[in-house]
């Protein structure tokens, strides 16, 4: 699976759309998790409604919201009020019992608003600190905040 890079501005919302084969994943809940290391676990952030037929209802954990359109085969994750600490590698997953199938790997990057800094050039990259963990920006090119991924077979 390729890793898709999504960038969002700090303080704004970032929407991720993971598409999948609706028939293959019929009856399966979806989850959004954060990969903690090379071989480490993917830590669950939020998952869709426990009752699959109600998966269209938004489920929230903190500032992260998930909802699944099971007919269209699209699970949408919204990271609200994006913060530097939200930067990281995530996965969209399809759950079957204790098994989790990776639908998409998503690298979230958080950009600071250059207008916040009067002396800024094209892109202001703040220093990392304890409270500003993910501010090291790896791509300065602008990318769509809303991206749909091709279906996963």
């Amino acid at each position: 699976l390729n890793t898709t890079v999504l960038q969002g501005m700090a303080g704004q919302s970032l929407r991720v759309s993971c598409t999948y084969d609706a028939l293959k994943h019929w009856g399966r809940r979806k989850a959004w998790c954060r990969q903690l290391g090379e071989e480490g676990p993917c830590q669950r952030v939020v998952s869709t409604h426990g009752v699959w037929l109600l998966a269209f209802l938004k489920k929230r954990n903190g500032s992260t919201v998930i909802a699944d359109d099971t007919l269209a085969g699209t699970v949408t994750i919204t990271l609200k009020n994006l913060q530097a600490g939200d930067a990281g590698l995530y996965q969209c997953q399809s759950l079957r019992g204790r098994e989790a199938e990776v639908l998409q790997k998503v690298l979230v990057e958080v950009l600071e608003d250059p207008l916040d800094d009067q002396d800024a050039g094209d892109l202001w990259v703040p220093e990392e600190s304890s409270s500003f963990e993910g501010a090291q920006v790896e791509h300065s090119t602008s990318r769509n905040q809303e991206t749909s991924f091709p279906p996963t077979s």
């Epitope: 390729n2 890793t3 290391g37 090379e38 930067a87 590698l89 690298l107 600190s129 963990e133 790896e138």
Partner: antibody, heavy 122, light 104 residues
């Protein structure tokens, strides 16, 4: 700015020992794993040591080529990372780099220092 | 063990260049570094395919399992360097022997 600065290199006698230091700044040092990588003159890169973060119990890992002679440690309160190498051999002559990789939010992003040179010779 | 090939290659400006890195067992991701003489290695590609900050878009990385590659579309003189692959998946965190790319 995210930065790693190594020090402690120099000329050392064979069978002697050395202690290298790496000063980290600009990031949450205590949440990241830290590594030492070396490069002998005209040769390729060799990973030799790693220490993980406190949340991973400061687990250490060493390359077979040095495992009986090496200790790495860290001081999270001072943002310092250390390498101690004993029973030095001429083949330990190399540039030693401090590298951030692993643990932390941005575990996949490497940060390298500029290196410190160690020469083992009589 | 990571095996890089070729060990040495030359390319003309504008040429497409591909170098490979083969792992003796499956790894999760591959990392690539660029090193020029008398300089420390620079992170170049991480998580197999993501370009590090400041790396020109003519570079790309791909692969999975045991087979990985770095490609340069339209080689430029400044790309002449030695490129190392590395896996951080398991101990020992090995590097490949390097591919030295020279300009024709």
């Amino acid at each position: 700015e995210v930065q790693l600065v190594e020090s402690g290199g120099g000329l050392v006698q064979p069978k002697g020992s050395l202690k290298l230091s790496c000063a980290a700044s600009g990031f949450s040092f205590n949440t990241y794993a830290m590594n030492w990588v070396r490069q002998a003159p005209g040769k390729g890169l060799e990973w030799i040591a790693r220490i993980r973060s406190k949340s991973n119990n400061y687990a250490t890992y060493y390359a077979d080529s040095v495992k009986d002679r090496i200790t790495c440690s860290r001081d999270d309160s001072e943002n310092m990372f250390y390498l101690q190498l004993s029973s030095l051999k001429t083949e330990d002559t190399a540039m030693y780099y401090c590298v951030r990789h692993g643990d932390g939010n941005l575990w996949y992003i490497d940060v390298w220092g500029t290196g410190t040179t160690v020469t083992v010779s009589t | 063990v990571l095996t890089q090939s070729p060990a040495l290659m030359s390319a003309s400006p504008g040429e497409k260049v591909t170098m490979t890195c083969s792992a003796s067992s499956s790894v999760s991701y591959m990392y690539w570094y660029q090193q020029k003489p008398r300089s420390s290695p620079k992170p170049w590609i991480y998580l197999t395919s993501i370009l590090a900050s400041g790396v020109p878009a003519r570079f790309s990385g791909s692969g999975s399992g045991t087979s990985y590659s770095l490609t340069i579309n339209n080689m430029e003189a400044e790309d002449a360097a030695t490129y190392y692959c590395q896996q951080w998946s398991f101990n020992p965190y090995t590097f490949g022997g390097g591919t030295k790319l020279v300009i024709k």
